[in-house]
Interface confidence: medium
């Protein structure tokens, strides 16, 4: 399934954002984890820029396995919410938030779920959505992100993520894979790729490729457990590299490199 919606107005919209069940008014969304950079930031309002700002180059640069390679893939994993589920609910979490791997190397986007009742196997669905905004462009040119951020922050929504939260009609949406029991089915676009759902609900790519950059949503559906936080997402960025220089987007904190 591929949906290529193309709007002509503002690049951000009223996306779904975080999924908190309405019956849990006491359960606040977990704030996004932003990572700081030095005084050059100059902009207190750049909540999203902080996602791009800091030290991936410092974390990655000294790793010998990274030198001289053509590209790297950076996976930024983000829990959409974090709260205790009530009875008869699903709790989906994305853990191990940092993966830096070489292009064409494997990567696993970890996802686990807990259910309060398990009479039937739930369906695990991994869905891909392209970024709402160009992370690289915003990292290189912070002015291009300011206007939209200012509007959102002025509306009292400092947790707004302009790269993830927008209407599906203005981005590409695809089902990557689904799993029920031991049966894994790849979406049409991913047929022929060595991609599978392993373990509890982890999405594993044998080889990452150009075009894999985007937001990956892990959702778990069960007829018995209708409440709860049944979705979490991971951001995956495929980046080109200068040979011998491990400078990527200015600002992600690097996790371990998988080679």
């Amino acid at each position: 399934m591929q949906q290529d919606g193309l709007g002509v107005g503002t690049r951000n919209g009223s996306g779904k954002g975080r999924s908190v069940h309405p019956s849990w008014p006491w359960c606040a969304p977990r704030p996004l984890r932003y990572f700081g950079r030095d005084a050059r930031a100059r902009r207190a309002q750049t909540a999203a820029m902080a996602l791009l700002a800091g030290g991936l180059s410092r974390g990655l640069g000294s790793h010998p396995a990274a030198a001289g390679r053509d590209a790297v893939v950076f996976v930024w994993l983000l829990l959409s919410t974090w709260c205790t589920a009530p009875a008869r609910a699903i709790q989906v979490t994305v853990s191990n938030p940092y993966h830096v791997v070489i292009l064409f190397q494997p990567v696993t986007l970890p996802c686990t779920y807990q259910m309060t009742s398990t009479p039937t196997q739930p369906i695990v669905i991994w869905k891909y959505k392209s970024f709402c905004r160009d992370r690289i462009a915003d990292a290189f040119s912070p002015a291009s992100v300011d206007n939209q951020l200012n509007a959102q922050l002025a509306a009292g929504n400092p947790g707004y993520n302009p790269y993830v939260e927008c209407q599906d009609s203005v981005r590409t949406v695809r089902v990557v894979a689904t799993k029920q029991g031991n049966a894994v089915t790849l979406g049409d676009y991913y047929q022929g790729r060595r991609i599978t759902i392993t373990g509890n609900a982890d999405l594993t790519f044998d080889q990452t490729a150009w075009g894999d950059s985007g937001v990956y949503y892990c959702s778990v559906v069960s007829a018995q457990d209708l409440q709860g936080n049944n979705e979490a997402y991971a951001e995956l960025i495929v980046l080109g590299r200068t040979s011998g220089v491990a400078e990527l987007l200015p600002g992600f904190q690097a996790g371990p490199i998988e080679d």
């Epitope: 193309l6 709007g7 180059s57 590209a71 490729a209 985007g214």
Partner: antibody, heavy 115, light 109 residues
Framework: EVQLVESGGGVVQPGRSLRLSCAAS????????MHWVRQAPGKGLEWVAV????????YYADSVKGRFTISRDNSKNTLYLQMNSLRAEDTAVYYC????????WGQGTLVTVSS | QTVVTQEPSLTVSPGGTVTLTCASS?????????PTWIQQKPGQAPRALIH???YKHSWTPARFSGSLVGDKAALTLSGVQPEDEAEYYC?????????FGGGTKVTVL
């Protein structure tokens, strides 16, 4: 009004060096990434290099990697391209372009590498 | 080596419609490649028309529109004017690298 003015082009022998400049005005230069793009005579556009708003991150096309260096001086609102070990195939008009979507372009400066 | 492919040339009548396409050797072009379309007239510097697949600059005439068609990025000129005769370049972003297509020469006859 946004203006980008390239300079520094000329005729140079193979193996020699040249430094191009791009003077920017009409926008907050220090807030935007900048590109260099070139066009050989009668040919298409070729991306050369990009630099982030603060100069901390740079990317290069494979064809110039290790020979060309992109830099900027935000206090002077100027973008630079240092070109070393020039080859005949580097002969082209060199353009600077603003932001990563290349919304504004300069008029270009011609670099001719010839013995 | 990544290659971006465009039609070498297309001919259109004044008032007609023409669609230029842009393909990537790496597979389907999606919005994640942030397709950009640039126009260049003979003897002039390039000028950006469309960015991020379909977004127009303030100076872009309404008759130009960008989209994704199948596995390609597309630029459609509707109600073509004589002044639209030019070379049109597609630009795709591959992480930290930008690749231009070879350009499409649009002739208005």
């Amino acid at each position: 009004e946004v203006q980008l003015v390239e300079s520094g082009g000329g005729v140079v022998q193979p193996g020699r060096s040249l430094r191009l400049s791009c003077a920017a005005s009409g926008f907050t230069f220090s807030s935007y990434g900048m590109h260099w793009v070139r066009q050989a005579p009668g040919k298409g556009l070729e991306w050369v290099a990009v630099i982030s708003y603060d100069g901390s991150n740079k990317y290069y096309a494979d064809s110039v990697k290790g020979r060309f260096t992109i830099s900027r001086d935000n206090s002077k609102n100027t973008l630079y391209l240092q070109m070393n070990s020039l080859r005949a195939e580097d002969t082209a008009v060199y353009y600077c372009a603003k932001d990563l979507n290349m919304d504004y372009w300069g008029q270009g400066t011609l670099v001719t590498v010839s013995s | 080596q990544t290659v971006v492919t465009q039609e070498p040339s297309l001919t259109v009548s004044p008032g007609g419609t023409v669609t230029l396409t842009c393909a990537s050797s790496t597979g389907a072009v999606t919005s994640g490649y942030y397709p950009t379309w640039i126009q260049q007239k003979p003897g002039q510097a390039p000028r950006a028309l469309i960015h991020t697949t379909s977004y127009k600059h303030s100076w872009t005439p309404a008759r130009f529109s960008g989209s994704l068609v199948g596995d390609k990025a597309a630029l459609t000129l509707s109600g073509v004017q004589p002044e639209d005769e030019a070379e049109y370049y597609c630009l795709l972003q591959y992480g930290g690298a930008w690749v231009f297509g070879g350009g499409t020469k649009v002739t208005v006859l």
